[in-house]
């Protein structure tokens, strides 16, 4: 599946939380970023993530005018020049510094099996989704469409009214 344009079709800032309302947070430790899944204190500020949406052509033999067969890919960047990456060998989700064009490991196919939550499928390993395991993000294999509603791969995007990427 190939990205159909080098520019995102839209971008916006949002805070990311689990289906159970735990926050996804990012902390700089020893010159690298760690990703945590945690309960925030009442007035603690949520970390923001820049979501960039790209169109991608799904590999298929479908006929039509080119409109059908598109999917949405997203990249997630919590801070400048750093993006979430799928490490398929380690089944882990990591923050890495990258330059554009971003590697395929930084792209995730967007799903929403609920109207108010989304899931992120690894572009480089179809059927594998970002999920929550032991208070960390991990890559989790989903073996059927019924399991797309499994809560540990569902995330909520809370909008923010700020437009600047910190």
């Amino acid at each position: 599946m190939s990205i159909t344009g080098i520019s995102p079709i839209t971008e916006y800032l949002a805070s990311l939380s689990t289906y159970n309302d735990q926050s996804i947070t990012f902390a700089l430790e020893d010159e690298s970023y760690e990703i945590y899944v945690e309960d925030l204190k009442k007035d603690e500020k949520k970390d923001k993530v820049l979501l960039s949406y790209y169109e991608s052509q799904h590999p298929s033999n479908e006929s039509g005018d080119g409109v059908d067969g598109k999917m949405l890919m997203v990249t997630l960047s919590p801070t400048k020049d750093f993006w979430l990456h799928a490490n398929n060998k380690e089944h882990s989700v990591e923050l890495h510094k990258s330059e554009k064009p971003l590697p395929d490991q930084a792209f995730f196919v967007l799903h929403n099996m609920h109207s108010n939550s989304v899931s992120f499928e690894s572009k480089t390993d179809p059927g594998v989704f970002i999920g929550v395991k032991d208070n960390h993000l991990a890559l989790i294999k989903v073996d059927s469409s019924e399991n797309l509603s499994t809560e540990n791969i569902l995330f909520k995007l809370s909008e923010t009214h700020h437009h600047h990427h910190h």
Epitope: T10, E62, D68, V109, N112, S115, S145, L148
Partner: antibody, heavy 121, light 106 residues
Framework: EVQLVETGGGLVQPGRSLKLSCKTS????????MYWIRQAPGKGLEWVSS????????YYPDSVKGRFTISRDNAENTIYLQMSSLRSEDTATYFC??????????????WGQGSLVTVSS | EIQMTQSPSVLSASVGDRVTLSCKAS??????LDWYQQKLGEAPKLLIY???NLQTGIPSRFSGSGSGTDCTLTINSLQPGDVATYFC????????FGGGTKLELD
């Protein structure tokens, strides 16, 4: 070529039931959200129902909740709208539509031509 | 529930005019907004998605813009074939249509 064809509309008395079908072709049906939207004569568009690709989740506005049921048959590439306890205000042309993208509920990429439902005694 | 308000409800313009249609959401919709064109007796057709992306096959005289709660559809150099009703549609939180703007020729 993507096609969506609605059938099952007609004249029905208040309080009765009716089932609409939307047969589709030309795309990977089981990967798309599907929708019903209606339009009363001379009025605007109103979203009526949505269903996820695997049929596991369905959504309705308050105006039809508890009376209308959306369902899908991924083997037959068809969605349905079961309407019960029909009221005069349900009189409308009912359109089915498919999502614009695989797997997501964003945008209505294609629409059928619609099926007219008239609720009157 | 997010409310979508379109203005004006009816707009008269001449061939060649630059026409602007407005859509206002009751809360931030994060660019999750489409524009649909419906000609008399026809099904609606997707023109613009995610606020400013032109659907395949739609003439480039159509464009969309906006962010937050305010979005705009612009038609540069209006053509006779553009006579229709235009609806905005949000999918940021549930699904809601605006009431429509009927575009007529003077």
């Amino acid at each position: 070529e993507v096609q969506l064809v609605e059938t099952g509309g007609g004249l029905v008395q208040p309080g009765r039931s009716l089932k609409l079908s939307c047969k589709t072709s030309g795309f990977t049906f089981s990967s798309y959200w599907m929708y019903w939207i209606r339009q009363a004569p001379g009025k605007g568009l109103e979203w009526v129902s949505s269903i996820t690709p695997n049929g596991g989740n369905t959504y309705y506005p308050d105006s039809v909740k508890g009376r209308f049921t959306i369902s899908r048959d991924n083997a037959e590439n068809t969605i349905y709208l079961q309407m019960s306890s029909l009221r005069s205000e349900d009189t409308a042309t009912y359109f089915c539509a498919k999502g614009h993208y695989y797997y997501t509920s964003y945008s209505l990429g294609y629409w059928g031509q619609g099926s007219l439902v008239t609720v009157s005694s | 529930e997010i409310q979508m308000t379109q203005s004006p409800s009816v707009l008269s313009a001449s061939v060649g005019d630059r026409v602007t249609l407005s859509c206002k959401a009751s809360q931030n919709i994060n660019k999750h907004l489409d524009w649909y064109q419906q000609k008399l007796g026809e099904a609606p057709k997707l023109l613009i998605y995610f606020t400013n992306n032109l659907q395949t096959g739609i003439p480039s005289r159509f464009s969309g813009s906006g962010s937050g709660t305010d979005c705009t559809l612009t038609i540069n150099s209006l053509q006779p074939g553009d006579v229709a009703t235009y609806f905005c549609f949000q999918y940021n939180n549930g699904w809601t249509f605006g009431g429509g703007t009927k575009l007529e020729l003077d």
